[in-house]
């Protein structure tokens, strides 16, 4: 009874299509598959960024796989052929591993790359990224930002750079169509006549870095003798109401009364007849139903009621004050 053997896939390689971290892993079928013509061969692929403790594992019948990587580090991958038990009289057969690596040859020392990269997607409309120049780089150093996400034919360069002393220190992005809920890849590279500049790579999802506009149209409504309803509206823009969480800060007679987090555009407050002044502010953030993370908006303008008996069952007058 001869032992069944199978060869590893051929020509296993990692291909960089220029998408700033989104790479193709591809291979060819193993040699000598003639004995297994009736069989559907599978491949077990393992890959990771060098330095990561865990491998990602994929089992596929295809001859390629695509995923995102951190190009600040190297990438290692290995693959072997699997013959399912149906082909081998009851036991799965695996080939030896074929292995490959990929890395971008780093230019320049790490200190020359951009520092403190910060990106915010304002109101789910306007993406702005800013950075500081590398440590010890000269004023002749300039940085260029490129970005890519699935849907673009190729990586694009920043349209509107923000400058300081002639150096690019940020980017205002153009309209980004169908760019959320997918990985967004950025590379900031640099050039200098004096020394090579290290490139930096960043990956995030836009919906997770949204900073909304603050809520607007804050009002008070008397609900009962001991309850006041605070109401506000979502700001103008593309973020639907279902995506907001709110934090309210309420001050009663100059002392902090309540800080609360709510999901709706209303909050009912218990009051006493002694209350002479009531002020509140609200801020918003994209909630867990629409993103994994987010940034609180600025606080709204402060809305106050003062000078009348709060126990009156009326729609209360309100004045604008700045928080």
């Amino acid at each position: 009874d001869t032992e069944i053997k199978v060869n590893p896939p051929q020509d296993f390689e990692i291909v960089d299509p220029g998408y700033l971290g989104y790479l193709y892993l591809q291979w060819q079928p193993p040699l000598s598959l003639d004995h297994f013509k009736e069989c559907t061969v599978e491949y077990e692929l393992k890959y990771r960024n060098i330095g990561s403790e865990t491998w990602k594992t994929i089992i596929t019948k295809n001859l390629h796989y695509k995923d995102g990587f951190d190009l600040n580090k190297g990438i290692e991958a290995k693959i072997h052929t699997l013959l399912p038990w149906q082909c081998t009289n009851g036991s799965e057969v695996q080939s030896s591993w074929a292995e490959t690596t990929y890395w971008i040859s780093p230019q320049g020392i790490p200190e020359t790359k951009v520092q403190d990269m910060d990106c915010v997607y304002y109101n789910w409309q306007y993406l702005l990224c800013s950075w500081k120049p590398g440590i010890g780089v000269l004023l002749d150093t300039n940085y260029n930002l490129f970005y890519w996400y699935e849907g673009l034919d190729h990586a694009l360069q920043c349209v509107d750079y923000i400058k300081a002393d002639g150096q690019n220190i940020g980017c205002r992005f153009p309209y980004l169509e169908a760019s959320d809920y997918k990985d967004f890849y950025i590379c900031v590279n640099g050039s200098s006549e004096n020394k090579p500049i290290r490139s930096s790579y960043f990956t995030f999802q836009l919906q997770n870095i949204v900073k909304p506009l603050p809520p607007v149209y804050l009002t008070f409504t008397r609900e009962s003798s001991c309850e006041i309803k605070l109401k506000w509206s979502i700001p103008l823009g593309p973020i639907p109401a279902r995506c907001f969480d709110y934090e309210i800060e309420i001050r009663e007679d100059d002392t902090t009364l309540v800080t609360a987090t709510v999901e709706n555009e209303t909050y009912t407050l218990k009051t006493t007849n002694e209350t002479r002044q009531l002020c509140f502010v609200v801020r918003s953030k994209v909630n867990i139903y629409c993103s994994d993370d987010g940034i609180w908006s600025e606080w709204s303008d402060k809305q106050c009621w003062e000078g009348e008996d709060l126990s009156k069952k009326t729609l209360l007058r309100h004045h604008h004050h700045h928080h």
């Epitope: 694009l156 509107d160 923000i162 940020g170 992005f173 153009p174």
Partner: antibody, heavy 119, light 111 residues
Framework: QVQLVQSGAEVKKPGASVKVSCKAS????????MNWVRQAPGQGLEWMGR????????DYNQNFKDRVTITRDTSASTAYMELSSLRSEDTAVYYC????????????WGQGTSVTVSS | EIVLTQSPATLSLSPGERATLSCRAS??????????MNWYQQKPGQAPRLLIY???RQGSGIPDRFSGSGSGTDFTLTISRLEPEDFAVYFC?????????FGGGTKLEIK
Amino acid sequence: QVQLVQSGAEVKKPGASVKVSCKASGYTFSNYLMNWVRQAPGQGLEWMGRIDPYDGDIDYNQNFKDRVTITRDTSASTAYMELSSLRSEDTAVYYCARGYGTAYGVDYWGQGTSVTVSS
Amino acid sequence: EIVLTQSPATLSLSPGERATLSCRASESVDNYGISFMNWYQQKPGQAPRLLIYAASRQGSGIPDRFSGSGSGTDFTLTISRLEPEDFAVYFCQQSKEVPWTFGGGTKLEIK
């Protein structure tokens, strides 16, 4: 909520200078470019220049041949446009106008400041 | 500088009709895969209002009857069904390169 409030109308003599202010509120001033556009009576629109409040970077329309100076005070969320060596053809309404970047156009405009140059 | 030519200078139509306004640039206003062409509406005594940016993107709060199209040097603003409040002057503007320039305007008047 976004508001651009400009200073009041001005009447100036030829050769004088005028400085128009534009106070921004309802948004983060430094995140958006501030443009200046003018419109002579019954005429079209003419872009004068823009400032990036984030870093102070400025682009001018060279047609104004060094007569225009655009500045900003980020702490006051205010942009300024000064036009010198005024002549009668500078009589126009001057607008400040906010735009996020070159691909977004100009989405909010001030109410306009009328400048009349007359001897 | 890039010169923008709008046509017609005046367009006389009735409410409910379709309006097609044209803007031609002296050179391409495309770059980075974007058409840097914007459209504005202006009514007497008022500041302009952004209708369309990047050739075809609707400005905030702009009704769906306004649409933009085109690339390179030829651009069109279409108002699918004219409302009484749409009769105004319309300007195209390029933001590809400094100095930003405006077209001479098309006056849309009631027939």
